[in-house]
């Protein structure tokens, strides 16, 4: 009988996986090392897939190897001593200056260098750098970047305001429509702030005498209606208004006279005025009733070569005349004339000239007041220093307003360095159909009077006092203000500006940076301003946009008996 050979020789088991081989009768048994399985221990056990020990007990990565396995960690984690658990590396604690001047924030497996809003981390310099949001086209119109943020601005002077998203711009809308109808038959005398509105030259037979007839309407108390002179400037006649009454000044080779008389006619009604040169006098009539007769020894204007040549100027006179007047007068006159007849020549030729020029046309209906059309400003130089006042400078302001648009600068003080140390503006409120009044120092709002119904038929009255220590609102309204400490800081800025030169602007701002104030739109509507007890007369301004009407205010388009006509009773002027 042949002996059965040793079944373990040659070795039938997988050399890597077996622990021992046991010879049997014509068979063998391989005993496997841990991590191996199969008849010949040829198969690796994948401990990472063992359902009874999920992921091999590893908290993160299980790596299977022939006959074994080991756990490993993802980047940013470290293995604990049990060789199974991975712990997050706290890089911020490990290297405290990892982020430089930024704040280090540990996150699982990593870290972040955090910067305040409006800043971005610079890996090279290990610091937070300002994000220039303006380069990312965040704003619809103008963008001003500053450390940590940005502000969008809209060109108020072009009629835009910042929308609620604080990025886009929207048109400042009309909140109270006005009747801006004009008629070419009505000549507007205040078309130019400085200068003559119309100039006519007459060459008539020598038997002619000076005469002027016209209907006249104004609320203005002073100004030149018309000025006539001889061709050689040797004789002249001035028809003006002073204190609401007709004034005549005349000068020729025989005489020099000034006369004022008649009733007050700056009542906003049409008054028929006639000035007629008679043989021995000049007759002035109002509503066909003689109010003045001025004696004259000879003809007003001397004919030459059989012709009477006369130059007539409406609403002004040549510059050189100013020094020759018997009594100086501010020539600016906000008024209208119609149905004129000069030198008994009717209106021939003049109507045709006026018809073509829209800005020479007068409004059909007007009310008393000053009108800012939202296209320009008036400038005043006011001395706010009061020697007798221990507080130094002070500003007492009374505004009577009837806005037509809900956003615009009503009053502003501007420094020589183009900052706006004080402004009172109107802004459309977040609540529908109402406005806020904001008082600002430079670009900081210090007072906000919220949600007032200002766009109404009735005028609103606002009164406040400012000095270096305080801002006091005298109209009983609910205000939102900054902290007392911040208010004092802002008043100190105003105080510093008031010690220098400031110009006062009504109706808007001159060319200052958009970022100089919270509001930069022109005011649109009617407004009367009293500063330190003086009613500001726009005819007395240093400069004024031609479109601003000093003494006439358009009527409201149509009166409706609805809630929009209701004004806060606290704002109604008790006078």
């Amino acid at each position: 009988v042949n002996a059965i050979p040793d079944q373990c020789s040659p070795l039938p088991c997988n050399e890597d996986g077996y622990m021992s081989c046991k010879d049997g009768k014509a068979s063998f048994t391989c005993t496997c090392k841990p991590g191996w399985q199969g008849e010949k221990c040829e198969f690796d056990i994948n401990e990472c897939k063992d359902p009874s020990n999920i992921n091999g007990g590893c908290s993160q990565i299980c790596d299977n190897t022939p006959g074994s396995y080991h756990c490993s960690c993802k980047s940013g984690f470290v293995m604990l001593s049990n060789k199974k658990d991975c712990k997050d590396v706290d890089e911020c604690s490990l290297k405290p200056n990892m982020c430089g001047t930024a704040v280090c924030k540990n996150i699982p497996g990593d870290f972040e260098c955090e910067c305040p809003e409006g800043y971005r981390y610079n890996l090279k310099s290990k610091s937070c750098e300002d994000v220039d949001e303006c380069s990312e086209n965040m704003c619809a119109q103008l963008c001003v970047n500053y450390p940590g943020g940005y502000t969008c601005y809209c060109d108020g002077k072009k009629g835009f305001k910042l929308a609620q998203d604080q990025k886009s711009c929207e048109a400042v809308s009309v909140c109270l429509p006005l009747n801006l109808d004009t008629k070419y038959e009505l000549l507007y005398l205040a078309e130019q702030f400085a200068g003559v509105v119309l100039y006519l030259k007459f060459r008539l037979p020598e038997i002619s005498r000076f005469s002027a007839e016209f209907d006249f309407r104004t609320y203005d108390s002073q100004g030149v209606i018309l000025y006539a002179e001889s061709i050689d400037h040797s004789a002249w006649l001035l028809i003006a208004l002073r204190g609401g009454k007709i004034e005549v000044q005349l000068k020729n080779e025989h005489t020099s006279k000034i006369t004022t008389g008649g009733d007050i006619i700056n009542n906003g009604l049409w008054n028929m005025v006639s000035v007629e040169e008679l043989e021995h006098s000049i007759s002035i009539k109002i509503a066909k009733e003689a109010v003045m007769d001025i004696n004259k020894p000879g003809p007003l204007f001397k004919p030459e070569n059989g012709l009477l040549e006369t130059k007539v100027y409406f609403a002004g006179f040549p510059r050189k005349v100013e020094s020759e007047l018997i009594k100086p007068i501010n020539p600016r006159l906000d008024g209208c004339i119609r149905s004129w007849n000069l030198m008994k020549q009717g209106a021939s030729g003049i109507k045709e000239i006026i018809q073509e020029k829209q800005n020479k046309h007068c409004l059909v209906t007007v009310e008393k007041g000053s009108y800012y059309p939202g296209s320009g400003i008036a400038e005043f130089h006011i001395d706010y220093n009061n020697g007798s006042n221990a507080e130094g400078w002070h500003i007492n302001v009374t505004l009577n307003i009837r806005p037509s648009m809900g956003t615009g600068v009503m009053l502003a003080l501007v420094s020589s360095n183009n900052t706006v140390p004080f402004a009172v503006s109107l802004v459309d409120s977040t609540s529908e159909k109402s406005q806020d009044i904001v008082i600002s120092v430079e670009n900081t709002v210090i007072y906000r009077i919220q949600a007032l119904s200002l766009c109404s038929n009735q005028r609103s009255h606002l009164e406040f006092r400012v000095n270096r220590n305080n801002l006091e609102l005298l109209t009983p309204l609910k205000i939102e203000t900054i902290s007392q400490e911040e208010l004092q800081t802002q008043l100190a800025i105003l105080d510093k500006a008031m010690k220098g030169k400031v110009a006062t602007y009504l109706g808007g701002l001159p060319d200052v940076p958009f970022s100089a104030t919270p509001v930069n739109a022109f005011y649109n509507g009617c407004m009367e301003v009293n500063i330190n007890g003086v009613e500001l007369d726009l005819d007395e301004a240093i400069s004024k946009h031609n479109d601003i009407r000093a003494h006439s205010c358009p009527s409201v388009w149509k009166k409706t008996k609805n809630s929009e006509d209701q004004v806060d009773p606290r704002l109604i002027d008790g006078k």
Epitope: L80, K87, D90, P108
Partner: antibody, heavy 119, light 106 residues
């Protein structure tokens, strides 16, 4: 398997000195941060000192209560960490544990050695 | 300096009862670690990085929290869970432990 074995505890008089040792095995000692933590009934668990790895310049840190009196050191060739304690006070009494520290937590602890400071 | 306050100092629970212990910090921290210590033994790392259980720790344990308030919760008390639990944090080169919560079985 990580093994930490403290030795050197005993009774010492106030003002005296004592040096504790910790023998480590089962891990790459030179890469490890090692700490001493003590425990007393009065103060509970209290961290004492830390010595970091060669990669971290063997930097040492101490609790305010032991600064200037205790010194932590290590010998990477012997896989050992030491705590030299001088000017001992009764409040230093407690069980002193040697710990393997991983990413700011005490990963493995020895069985502890007791120090008694008393006259 | 950061201080950790554990509450309650001692508590007891019946088998199967839910247990919650808290660790309050006087200043915000990123992570909290928890240790278990049984009488006569050294402390053992139990929960790390606020909510991760060390391998071998029963799943009835859980950790949570952020900023200045952290907690360890045991969903169902068992006899072997009776021990003292310590919270620990690291900040500004200093390690701090809480005073411990001793959990006893009723």
């Amino acid at each position: 398997e990580v093994k930490l074995e403290e030795s050197g505890g005993g009774l010492v008089q106030p003002g005296g000195s004592m040096k504790l040792s910790c023998a480590a095995s089962g891990f790459t000692f030179s890469d490890a941060w090692m700490d001493w933590v003590r425990q007393s009934p009065e103060k509970g668990l209290e961290w004492v000192a830390e010595v970091r790895s060669k990669a971290d310049n063997h930097a040492t840190y101490y609790a305010e209560s032991v600064k200037g009196r205790f010194t932590i050191s290590r010998d990477d060739s012997k896989s050992a960490v030491y705590l030299q304690m001088n000017s001992l006070r009764p409040e230093d009494t407690g069980i002193y544990y040697c710990t393997l520290t991983t990413a700011f937590l005490f990963d493995s602890w020895g069985q502890g050695t007791t120090l008694t400071v008393s006259s | 300096q950061i201080a950790l306050t554990q509450s309650p100092a001692i508590m007891s629970a019946s088998p199967g009862e839910k247990v919650t212990m808290t660790c309050s910090v006087n200043s915000s921290v990123s992570y909290m670690h928890w240790y278990q210590q049984k009488p006569g033994s050294s402390p053992r790392l139990w929960i790390y990085d606020t909510s991760n259980l060390v391998s071998g720790v029963p799943g009835r344990f859980s950790g949570s929290g952020s900023g200045t308030s952290y907690s360890l919760t045991l969903s169902s008390m068992e006899a072997e869970d009776a021990a003292t639990y310590y919270c620990q944090q690291y900040s500004g080169y200093l390690y701090t432990f809480g005073g411990g919560t001793k959990l006893e079985i009723k």
